[in-house]
Every structure is written in C-alpha cells, then in structure tokens.
C-alpha cells in the first residue's frame, strides 16, 4: 500500500483578526476570527 505523508515544506501562519459586530449587523461588541494561510476560518 502507498503511504501518504503531508509535508508541505513551509509553515502555515495564523493570526487573530478582530472585527466590530456593528459593521456586519446591528449587534455591538467584537467578533474574533482566525486567519490561517490567508483564509478566515473562525
């Protein structure tokens, strides 16, 4: 059987991003997301 290993050779950086809820709706407060590899995932 073939063995598959994920070894991309580079590090994927992540960064916390914070948005104001009122920019996307009527709520107040902050929305915290996580950007991994250029994509906001949370």
């Amino acid at each position: 059987d073939a063995e598959f290993r994920h070894d991309s050779g580079y590090e994927v950086h992540h960064q916390k991003l914070v948005f104001f809820a009122e920019d996307v709706g009527s709520n107040k407060g902050a929305i915290i997301g996580l950007m991994v590899g250029g994509v906001v995932i949370a």
Epitope: L17, V18, F19, F20, E22, D23, A30
Partner: nanobody, 124 residues
Framework: EVQLLESGGGVVQPGGSLRLSCAAS????????MGWFRQAPGKGREFVAA????????YYADSVKGRFTISRDNSKNTVYLQMNSLRPEDTALYYC?????????????????WGQGTLVTVSS
C-alpha cells in the same frame, strides 16, 4: 480619507494618567472605525485600542485592558485615549489611525490614514 492630528502626550510618572486626543478633518469621520497604535523605541508598531464608528463598541490589547479607555465624539470629529496606571513599558510614540468599516481592527494593514504621533514617556 481623513487627516489626523494627535495631541496630549508628555512625561508622566509611573502610576500617573494622560489623555490623548486625535482630531480628524473631513466630513466622513463617522464612516471610520478609529484606533490607537504605539511604537516603542526599537520595536514594531503595536495595536492598543479601537472604537467603532458609533462609539458603542471598543476593543483593547491585553496589555492595556483595564487601564486604558478609548472613546470618540463624532460631533467634534475627535477620538480620545484615556491612559491610567501608566507603566514604564507604556513609553512609546502613540499613533491615531482610521480604518474603513468591515476591516479587521487589530491589524495595522486595515488602517488607511495615520497621524504623525504623540510621544508618551513614563519615567520617575
């Protein structure tokens, strides 16, 4: 875009307080989320605090939470940073900046307009 001018910096003893102001020119002030950043000697520019377009929502860096308060007065096109319980590590050049709505408020690249900065020195 808006033009920004900070004031209120100075020398203060540890434990003291300062209030920074940032006056904005332009009729579109309330279209921008506003933030404060700081840059200590020999270090990078770091996020301090931000306030939403309406002034209702705020967000702070962990290092200043509970000590600093950001606010704005849209009738005066001005944003404020009240700094209490100042520490020597708060010594830095403080910059006011404006970010378009919908952009991440805690990262430098979101901010399209910057002031020239006002120097805060905390020393005994």
């Amino acid at each position: 875009e808006v033009q920004l001018l900070e004031s209120g910096g100075g020398v203060v003893q540890p434990g003291g307080s300062l209030r920074l102001s940032c006056a904005a020119s332009g009729r579109t002030f309330n279209n921008y989320n506003m933030g404060w950043f700081r840059q200590a000697p020999g270090k990078g520019r770091e996020f301090v605090a931000a306030v939403s377009r309406s002034g209702v929502s705020t967000y702070y860096a962990d290092s200043v939470k509970g000590r600093f308060t950001i606010s704005r007065d849209n009738s005066k096109n001005t944003v404020y940073l009240q700094m209490n319980s100042l520490r020597p590590e708060d010594t830095a050049l403080y910059y006011c900046a404006a970010a378009y709505r919908g952009t991440a408020i805690n990262v430098r690249r979101s901010y399209s307009s910057w002031g020239q900065g006002t120097l805060v020195t905390v020393s005994s």
